[in-house]
Interface confidence: medium
């Protein structure tokens, strides 16, 4: 089991360190944005921060988002789906409920 | 439930080194950073550095660069701390976190 | 020395407020980095109280509450009980260390 959840699209209006503006953080760098990281990373909360983390890749578990304001903040956040990928539930993955359903990046 | 079960009580002389460490369970191992924290008798927490469990990456404390080695056994869902030339102001309860949860902390003392 | 400072001591009688403050700087609480509170009781391992500078982890009494504004925090206990009695710590990220930072710590005492 993974309690990660996804990237919450929100952004801050603050100034970063010039240190980051020089160079993209890398897997793990403390973020403020998707933009402070590196090509393929994006900025997702870690619990004590939000840090650079991998976009997801195809058959990976993602957490499709329900209504904004629907749920508290998410401690642990995945990565959206990668391009050319959307976060949908796993067609051979049966669950008593919607809710619980494993979704996965698949293929447009 | 999340768990973090550290190694026992050491003692240590100065100039030592001391190796201790935090096993996980109740969570996919893999999935998340492992920081350690100090606390010397009667004082504040202190941040040492973190650990990818899955890439075994690191990050260290400016104050512990070239003196921590922090380590992973992703098989046995095992994190390490190691910290070398050991002063008589290590002495401190070390843990490590999952951020959210902590382990119970290993109490080091180093005296001559 | 730690950049982010609390009151050193905090003090109530049972059923009444108190705050403790975490004053930080632009490039700490003032850049936008999330501060977390922690609870530490004697002998035992932090306890996470707030987290994401409002939020309570379930389990946390709605006694307790946070705020943040500008370069600092702050962490409300309403209605004072003898079981608050322990250490506090706020907790962010700072960018100019390039690691993360704990409060100095405030020990809250419930009177008579």
């Known amino acids: 089991g993974n309690d990660h959840s996804t990237l919450d699209g929100y952004s801050r209006r603050t100034t970063l360190s010039s240190k980051m503006y020089h160079s993209k953080g890398q897997e793990g760098s403390v973020c403020l944005r998707s933009s402070d990281c590196a090509t393929g990373l994006c900025c997702a909360r870690h619990f004590w921060s939000k840090i650079c983390k991998p976009v997801l890749k195809e058959g990976q578990v993602c957490t499709k988002h329900r209504r904004k304001g629907s749920h508290g903040l998410e401690i642990f956040q995945r990565c959206y789906c990668g391009e050319g990928l959307s976060c949908r539930i796993q067609k051979d993955h049966h669950q008593a409920s919607n809710s619980s359903r494993l979704h996965t990046c698949q293929r447009h | 439930q999340v768990q973090l079960l550290q190694s026992a009580a050491e003692v240590k002389k100065p100039g030592e080194s001391l190796k201790i460490s935090c096993k996980g369970s109740?969570?996919?191992?893999?999935?998340?950073?492992l920081h350690w924290v100090r606390q010397a008798p009667g004082q504040g927490l202190e941040w040492m550095g973190w650990i990818n469990a899955n890439s075994g990456a690191t990050n260290y404390a400016q104050n512990f660069q070239g003196r921590v080695t922090m380590t992973r056994d992703t098989s046995i869902s095992a994190a390490y701390m190691e910290l070398s030339s050991l002063r008589s102001d290590d002495t401190a309860v070390y843990y490590c976190?999952?951020?959210?949860?902590w382990g119970r902390g290993t109490t080091v003392t180093v005296s001559s | 020395q730690s950049v982010l400072t609390q009151p050193p001591s905090a003090s109530g009688a049972p059923g009444q407020r108190v705050t403790i403050s975490c004053t930080g700087s632009s490039s700490n609480i003032g850049a936008g980095y999330d501060v977390h509170w922690y609870q530490q009781l004697p002998g035992a391992a932090p306890k996470l109280l707030i987290y994401g500078n409002s939020n309570r982890p379930s389990g946390v009494p709605d006694r307790f509450s946070g705020s943040k504004s500008g370069t600092s925090a702050s962490l409300a206990i309403t209605g004072l009980q003898a079981e608050d009695e322990a250490d506090y710590y706020c907790?962010?990220?700072?960018?100019?260390?390039?690691?993360?930072?704990f409060g100095t710590g405030t020990k809250v005492t419930v009177l008579g």
């Open positions: 907790q962010s990220y700072d960018s100019s260390l390039s690691g993360y930072v």
């Open positions: 976190t999952r951020e959210d949860h």
């Open positions: 109740g969570y996919d191992f893999p999935g998340y950073y």
